[in-house]
Interface confidence: medium
């Protein structure tokens, strides 16, 4: 059974992940971002189901495409550090989902834009956090 300290750690890691995903989304939605239209042409795979921490496998598998899109989107008005940012997110995802169980991610038939993709995982984080508090 999870202890209160492990639950607290999980909650903090989820909050960390949530904030980083929100930062990316805020950057993309920034009124100054000139490459938003182009960014929306890239398609991301969405999880068929995302209700447990093991489902973060689906996010992990899409981190490389996310990094590539963020790299392409770099401009004067949209400056992130994709390599470091995605590396930070990857570390949290690995810690949260654990490496003990091998979970095969199932994806939905419909692909999504980067905005829809980020919103989906932001909602996931918020949902899990609410069950922990």
């Amino acid at each position: 059974a999870p202890t209160s300290s492990s639950t607290k750690k999980t909650q903090l890691q989820l909050e960390h992940l949530l904030l980083d995903l929100q930062m990316i989304l805020n950057g993309i939605n920034n009124y100054k971002n000139p490459k938003l239209t182009r960014m929306l042409t890239f398609k991301f795979y969405m999880p068929k189901k995302a209700t447990e921490l093991k489902h973060l496998q689906c996010l992990e598998e899409e981190l490389k495409p996310l990094e590539e899109v963020l790299n392409l989107a770099q401009s004067k008005n949209f400056h992130l550090r994709p390599r470091d940012l995605i590396s930070n997110i990857n570390v949290i995802v690995l810690e949260l989902k654990g490496s003990e169980t091998t979970f095969m991610c199932e994806y939905a038939d419909e692909t999504a834009t980067i905005v829809e993709f980020l919103n989906r995982w932001i909602t996931f984080c918020q949902s899990i956090i609410s069950t922990l508090t």
């Epitope: 909050e15 960390h16 992940l17 949530l18 904030l19 980083d20 929100q22 930062m23 805020n26 950057g27 920034n30 100054k32 971002n33 790299n71 770099q74 004067k76 008005n77 949209f78 400056h79 992130l80 550090r81 994709p82 390599r83 470091d84 940012l85 930070n88 997110i89």
Partner: antibody, heavy 121, light 110 residues
């Protein structure tokens, strides 16, 4: 208005770890939209970026210092901290903390008053 | 990696106009925003220009910034020089890996 204040030991022995804290007042680290940065200036010399951190705890470091630097954040205390390990005399400098926008580019405003750290035995 | 090169020092009389250059050694100066900081002796830097040509509130319009792609340089121009403008000025930019500062220019108001 937002103010930043550095604090920590002014003297550190070679090979030890330099530890500094920046306390933010007049605004909240948790409000988002900004990274929180450390920059240093060697005596009589130019400025050097060390790294910055987001409220989430995600940190980004200068490639030249990455192996020795750790930046952490404590949103409950409205503080962020710098640790620089294995210091030498070359790390003697005035250390500044500053605020940086997250998306529209890396620049620094406002800056703290700075704190001089001397590395000497 | 690249470098930002500034003149070591410039001097001009009160009331005149002075321009400080900042040349990027490789890559386009226009690809990322350039900032300028003023540092008076014994004080911390303050921003006088951000995002190439934007002035923070409280900075007089005597200060202006520009980018010249042909010379791959940025410039800080100060008109109507005052003795209080005497300070070190640093340009600064960044890329997806690092942050870069120029070596600084000492402005002397004669």
């Amino acid at each position: 208005q937002l103010q930043l204040q550095e604090s920590g030991p002014g003297l550190v022995k070679p090979s030890q770890t330099l530890s500094l804290t920046c306390t933010v007042s007049g605004g909240s680290i948790s409000s988002g939209g900004y990274y929180w940065s450390w920059i240093r200036q060697h005596p009589g010399k130019g400025l050097e970026w060390i790294g910055y951190i987001y409220k989430s705890g995600s940190a980004y470091y200068s490639p030249s210092l990455k192996s020795r630097v750790t930046i952490s954040v404590d949103t409950s205390k409205n503080q962020f901290s710098l640790k620089l390990s294995s210091v030498t005399a070359a790390d003697t400098a005035v250390y500044y903390c500053a605020r940086t926008p997250t998306v529209t580019g890396d620049w620094f405003d406002p800056w703290g008053r700075g704190t001089l750290v001397t590395v000497s035995s | 990696n690249f470098m930002l090169t500034q003149p070591h020092s410039v001097s001009e009389s009160p009331g005149k106009t002075v321009t400080i250059s900042c040349t990027r050694s490789s890559g386009s100066i226009a690809s990322n925003y350039v900032q300028w900081y003023q540092q008076r002796p014994g004080s911390s830097p303050t921003t006088v220009i951000y995002e190439d040509n934007q002035r923070p509130s409280g900075v007089p319009d005597r200060f202006s910034g520009s980018i010249d792609s042909s010379s791959n340089s940025a410039s800080l121009t100060i008109s109507g020089l005052k003795t209080e403008d005497e300070a070190d000025y640093y340009c600064q930019t960044y890329d997806s890996i690092d942050v870069y500062f120029g070596g600084g220019t000492k402005l002397t108001v004669l």
